[in-house]
Interface confidence: low
């Protein structure tokens, strides 16, 4: 004979476990139904009645099958330096990620806790490593024969143009000035841009430790070797 299908609530076999989407209620000592995502347990099961589920209230959610008495509260609204990439629904929490031009300085389980502006490399420095969602731009000094004359979070050091006759030699922050009318370059002309990261902060200019709310005068920290940190390289 085929085994009978047990309907919740039911007592499990000795040493047995409850089925998928069921839980063992210690008080009733029965296997009872879990509530689906977007709902919570309004009334717990008894020996004779199954769990009663109810929808999550506004601004609360459950993401998994559960038997919690109350749904979880969605996180607070995204701050001004963030964008909401996942709305708060009955089945999922709000997720805030950093807006373009910022990166996540402090992550949390989902989304970002603290965004910081992407570092900009000052003239004479170029981007050595572009920013990512969770890491800042790394700048490096332009090597001899290359320059950057911009304050940018994306520009790399570019080669000086090659002149027939040099009017002004180039340096790390300025291109060479030629007297010939049609100079050539050792590489493709024009500024070279690295792709902008999805969410990205300001290097080597006087700092902008804070975004638009920062004071007019930025606070310059001393030049020195970078404290060691994972995934960080010095200039």
């Amino acid at each position: 004979l085929p085994a009978q299908v047990a309907f919740t609530p039911y007592a499990p076999e000795p040493g047995g476990t409850c089925r998928l989407r069921e839980y063992y209620d210690q008080t009733a000592q029965m296997c009872c139904s879990k509530c689906p995502p977007g709902q919570h347990a309004k009334v717990f099961c008894t020996k004779t009645s199954d769990t009663v589920c109810d929808s999550c209230e506004d601004s609360t959610y459950t993401q998994l099958w559960n038997w919690v008495p109350e749904c979880l509260s969605c996180g607070s609204r995204c701050s001004s330096d963030q964008v909401e990439t996942q709305a708060c629904t009955r089945e999922q929490n709000r997720i805030c990620t950093c807006r373009p031009g910022w990166y996540c300085a402090l992550t949390k389980q989902e989304g970002c806790r603290l965004c910081a502006p992407l570092r900009k490399c000052r003239p004479g420095f170029g981007v050595a490593r572009p920013g990512t969602e969770t890491s800042d731009v790394v700048c490096k000094p332009c090597a001899p024969g290359t320059f950057s004359n911009t304050t940018s979070s994306t520009d790399i050091c570019r080669p000086h143009q090659i002149c027939n006759v040099v009017a002004v030699p180039g340096n790390a922050s300025m291109d060479a000035v030629c007297t010939s009318t049609s100079p050539t370059r050792s590489m493709a002309p024009g500024p070279v841009h690295l792709p902008q990261p999805v969410s990205t902060r300001s290097q080597h200019t006087q700092p902008t430790p804070a975004p638009s709310t920062a004071p007019g005068t930025s606070f310059l920290l001393p030049v020195g070797p970078s404290p060691p940190a994972e995934g960080s390289t010095g200039d």
Partner: nanobody
Amino acid sequence: DVQLVESGGGLVQPGGSLRLSCGGSGFTFSSYGMSWVRQAPGKGLEWVSGIYDDGSVTDYADSVKGRFTISRDDAKNTVYLQMNSLKSEDTALYYCATGEDGELNYWGQGTQVTVSS
């Protein structure tokens, strides 16, 4: 690894005072300028105050000038923020931060300051 740990936050009434501390480890503390940055609920980051590596220069955001004082004790690898005459708009998560060449690359986890009656 660079570590910054803030403490001293809490609930205080308007007009009251608090002293935040930030302990640093994993780097030569005395060689680095330190900053305090805050984030009010639902708002962006706001730089509050900074102090040079040797303590010779301190600077403050206009919103806290005359009320907040930053100081450091290199023997204890600690920077402090003395906050007096606190206002409700000072309610925020306060972060201690440092880095090289003026950039704030290293942040603590923050300490909550709530000013409410």
